[in-house]
């Protein structure tokens, strides 16, 4: 699980203390930090709203927390992209937006996030319970994909809490090539400085030029992530029960969220960020089914005044041949 | 030089079905969306749908979805188009436009159009 | 399905002269991630088919001479030909390439005095 903690500055060691040999060993380390701190396992956020309006119309959000540039992003439902889901959209960062019926607008809302609506009415509608998923392919991290539905169950009176419910995906190549080696080298860099704790010369102490010491960010692998190595899907429940927009608030109540990050949800920061919507709750969790979500994972507070958000913003990726990855 | 070549102008019966085919040349036949609109007096120009010839995708525009059926021949690089249960309001001429390099929509080459007139 | 409204419906020009016409949508046609506007403008010369003057609102398309100028973002576009040529004479159509189903406006038709 990923967690914020401050770490105390790292001093250089004082001049003649070790040779040649420790001087190099030591530059190791301040790359793999470098490494540790600046990469870390990209996340996808979902967001489902029914509008209390429209009893059948849906808004579902999504976004990428990564450090890649996205090439893509399909939307569909019934299911995750390429196992059962019926595509609903497909986003190109630079050559526009294709979608299909129900799919009523779907639109960039900034460089990480796409907003996608749902048509009311009609056959192919959905339903409350569907199952909702955001595949985002981005270099270098791969294709990562966080599914969700509405809570099963919601009291129309109240608005519905977000409810963290991912379903993690990544593409092993991704996956495997680069946070393989980040991990080996974080796990090797830890067992560096365990080593130089024993001795007197390289020491961890506080920054002299500032009474504050730096923050950087530190993980471990989540059960969750661990778990979409060897598991590439949880079960869903797709059938869909109409019944289940009887709780739906036939004056206009309150809308219900699911929010479902995939990791520890980082908000895109800045003046694009959606101020109005709920920050997803930050945690690991892998989808047993529909409603019945099985926590994988201690669960860390909301941001607060002691963790640092780190901003992540990137330029759009260049176009990927002409008809780009359908 | 991108060609699209459509087949001639078609007379037929209410009630009947016709097929126009867009033959493409000069570029790589399935690297690009293949668009057909339709121009009508009334209307003006309107999106009757899409296919990918690379696989057989198609994504139409509802209001036509029960009038157009949209298929490839990739062995010879032609996009077709079937137009059925015709009725005197179907009347108008028909476009094949290849989707443009830069945008799923931009629409850069056109064919010479297919006028489909539908008379008793 | 946005909606693509031109206006006017025709103009009438001497050569030589600057015109402007107007395209608006019921949707903005910015994408959020390059902050380009998907709109297109076409040219159809009488008994001729559609050609692509402009794409992404202001981007010519090669081999469309400079005099004509796509302009605007969100939901207000205009196409601009700064110095009118007889060959000009001809339907102009705005299209929305933002999203399914592209839409065109109805055409403004310039006509040469």
């Known amino acids: 699980m990923r967690t914020e903690a401050q770490v105390p500055a790292l001093q250089p060691p004082e001049p003649g203390l070790e040779g040649a040999m420790g001087h190099r060993t030591l530059v190791l380390p301040w790359v793999l930090l470098t490494l540790c701190v600046t990469a870390g396992t990209p996340e996808v956020w979902v967001q489902v709203r029914m509008e209390a309006t429209e009893l059948s119309s849906f808004t579902i959000r999504c976004g990428f927390l990564g450090s890649g540039s996205i090439s893509l992003v399909t939307v569909s439902w019934g299911g995750p992209n390429g196992a059962g889901g019926t595509t609903l959209a497909v986003l190109h960062p630079e050559r526009g937006i294709r979608q299909w019926a129900p799919a009523r607008q779907a639109r960039w809302e900034t460089q990480s996030s796409i907003s996608l609506i749902l048509e009311g009415s009609g056959a192919s509608s959905p339903c409350a319970n569907t199952t909702f998923c955001c595949k985002f392919a981005s270099f270098p991290e791969g294709s990562w994909e966080a599914c969700g539905s509405l809570p099963p169950s919601s009291d129309p009176g109240l608005s519905a809490p977000p409810t963290p419910a991912p379903i993690l995906r990544a593409d092993l190549a991704g996956i495997l090539g680069v946070s393989g080696v980040l991990l080996f080298g974080c796990v090797y860099l830890l067992h560096l400085l365990r080593r130089h704790k024993h001795r007197p010369a390289p020491r961890l102490q506080p920054s002299r030029t500032s009474p504050q010491a730096p923050r950087a960010r530190a993980w471990a692998p989540s059960q969750a992530s661990q778990a979409a190595l060897h598991v590439p899907y949880a079960t869903i429940n797709t059938s869909c029960r109409p019944a289940t927009l009887d709780t739906a608030h036939p004056h206009g109540g309150p809308s219900w969220w699911a929010s479902l990050p995939t990791h520890a949800a980082h908000r895109p920061q800045g003046p694009a960020a959606w101020a109005s919507t709920p920050i997803p709750a930050r945690g690991s969790f892998v989808s047993v089914e529909n409603g019945l979500y099985a926590q994988a994972g201690e669960r860390p507070p909301h941001t607060g005044p002691g963790l640092t958000l780190f901003p992540d913003p990137r330029g759009p990726r260049a176009m990927e041949g002409p008809l780009g990855v359908r | 030089e991108v060609q699209l070549q459509q087949s001639g102008p078609e007379l037929v019966k209410p009630g009947t079905s016709v097929k126009i085919s867009c033959k493409a040349s000069?570029?790589?036949?399935?690297?690009?969306?293949m668009n057909w609109v339709r121009q009508s007096h009334e209307k003006s120009l309107e999106w009757i749908g899409e296919?990918?010839?690379?696989?057989?995708?198609?994504n139409y525009n509802q209001n036509f979805k029960a009038k157009a059926t949209l298929t490839v021949d990739k062995s010879s690089n032609t996009a077709y188009m079937e137009l059925r249960s015709l009725t005197s309001e179907d009347s108008a001429v028909f476009y094949c436009?290849?989707?443009?390099?830069?945008?799923?929509?931009?629409?850069?080459?056109w064919g010479q159009g297919t006028s489909v007139t539908v008379s008793s | 399905d946005i909606v693509m409204t031109q206006s006017p419906s025709s103009l009438a020009v001497s050569v030589g002269q600057k015109v402007t016409m107007s395209c608006k949508s019921s949707q903005s046609l910015l994408n959020g991630f390059n902050q380009k506007n998907f709109l297109a403008w076409y040219q159809q010369k009488p008994g001729q088919s559609p050609k692509l003057l402009v794409y992404f609102a202001s981007t010519r398309e090669s081999g469309v001479p400079d005099r004509f100028i796509g302009s605007g973002s969100g939901t207000d576009f205009t196409l601009t030909i700064t110095s009118v040529q007889a060959e000009d004479l001809a339907d102009y159509f705005c299209q929305q390439h933002h999203s399914t189903p592209p839409t065109f406006g109805g055409g403004t038709k310039l006509e040469i005095n």
């Open positions: 296919i990918n010839p690379k696989n057989g995708d198609t």
């Open positions: 436009a290849r989707e443009g390099v830069s945008s799923y929509y931009g629409m850069d080459s």
């Open positions: 000069g570029y790589t036949f399935t690297d690009y969306y």
